[in-house]
């Protein structure tokens, strides 16, 4: 896997040892956690991520609250099980034999169980929007302008295809960005959306996961765009399998 | 610029059926949970039926058997199927988008029912 050849480091991913210890001497990285190699030319999984942050100190875990509405990731930190491609397994149970489903960016999607519970597949999330409050500025940002610049930022700094930025709505002071990537339409080497996500929520937290950058200036025109409030919904392909009590609760 | 416009309405007599329709633009449509209320004159506004991101449906009791709301979210649009429409549902019919979690709520101006002999 590439990276940094002069000082071997992993440009998009910080939460890595890297060793030039490759074929040929070449550097490779390999995430906390979980030590798995990963590709430093592009995001690393969300699973990874989240396993290698679970790994480090003083992590505290907030719940997700499920609901039969989008889901909501409320940064529901656990320490998940991955593939062996970075992905995160259907299943995922803690240290008390407590299981539940997720889908494909890590959020649960049933109620819990216990370790007879069966998740048949990784059921994908082929639609996320990303609602953000901008801090007061003296007028509205030029609608044009902002949508220019997040496509930009995603498809440059994210890696993320263009065709997968499907909309950017704005109405002062909420900024919704909605990407949309279905299975067919996510070829080898696209950037999951689900990862471009979880990037942009953590460098919005001002908690970059990038190697050396430095935090995220989103700037509309030159006026800065500083976000007081994130929250991201997710849909999935098949809908979530809640009981009607939990719905109801 | 956020905006739900509502379609359909109109003079309807006793068991007839109108199909309402409740076009949204500015928002992402699809995350939303979708609601129809209706107003009678003197009267408070009260939920027909809602729909959730995934489809689920809700109805009012006085209404179950009779409407049926549906989503396209290719369309951006709400429907409200109304049959065996009676006097009582005479009334000025308003869409309603509510994003769970994000205190987003939006109105649509309303469209009249009216059914009459």
């Known amino acids: 896997h590439t990276a940094a050849q002069d000082n071997c480091t992993c440009p998009t991913n910080k939460m890595t040892v890297c060793s030039p210890d490759g074929p040929g001497g070449r550097c490779q990285c390999r995430a906390l956690g979980s030590g798995m190699a990963v590709d430093c030319s592009t995001l690393t999984s969300k699973c990874l991520l989240l396993k290698a942050r679970m790994s480090a100190p003083k992590n505290a875990r907030t719940l997700v609250r499920p609901s039969e509405h989008a889901l909501v990731d409320n940064d529901g930190l656990y320490d998940p099980d991955c593939d062996p491609e970075g992905r995160f397994k259907a299943r995922q149970c803690n240290q008390t034999s407590v299981c539940w489903c997720v889908n494909s960016v890590g959020v649960r999607r049933t109620d819990k169980g216990d370790l007879s519970l069966r998740c048949d597949e990784l059921v994908r999330t082929h639609h996320i929007l990303i609602d953000l409050r901008h801090r007061p500025t003296a007028g509205a940002f030029n609608h044009s302008d902002l949508d220019a610049e997040l496509r930009r930022l995603f498809r440059e700094r994210y890696r993320l295809h263009p065709k997968f930025v499907a909309a950017v709505h704005y109405e002062q002071p909420t900024i919704q960005i909605e990407l949309r990537q279905n299975t067919s339409q996510k070829a080898a080497g696209d950037v999951d959306i689900g990862d471009a996500a979880y990037y942009f929520e953590r460098d919005i937290k001002g908690e970059s996961l990038f190697q050396g950058r430095g935090g995220l200036d989103l700037r509309v025109r030159g006026e800065p765009l500083q976000v007081e409030r994130t929250l991201i919904y997710y849909l999935d392909e098949i809908p979530p399998k809640f009981s009607m009590k939990r719905l109801t609760a | 610029q956020v905006q739900l416009q509502e379609s359909g309405g109109g003079l309807v007599q006793p068991g007839g059926s109108l199909r309402l329709s409740c076009a949204a633009s500015?928002?992402?449509?699809?995350?939303?949970?979708m609601a129809w209320y209706r107003q009678a004159p003197g009267k408070q506004r009260d939920m027909v039926a809602t729909?959730?991101?995934?489809?689920?449906?809700n109805y009012a009791d006085s209404v179950k058997g009779r409407f049926t709301t549906s989503r396209d979210n290719a369309k951006n649009t709400v429907y409200l199927q109304m049959n065996s429409l009676k006097p009582e549902d005479t009334a000025v019919y308003v869409c309603?988008?509510?994003?769970?979690?994000?205190?987003?709520?939006?109105w649509g101006q309303g469209t009249q029912v009216t059914v009459s002999s």
């Open positions: 500015g928002f992402a449509f699809s995350f939303y949970a």
């Open positions: 729909i959730t991101a995934y489809g689920n449906t």
């Open positions: 309603n988008a509510n994003l769970p979690s994000a205190s987003h709520n939006y």
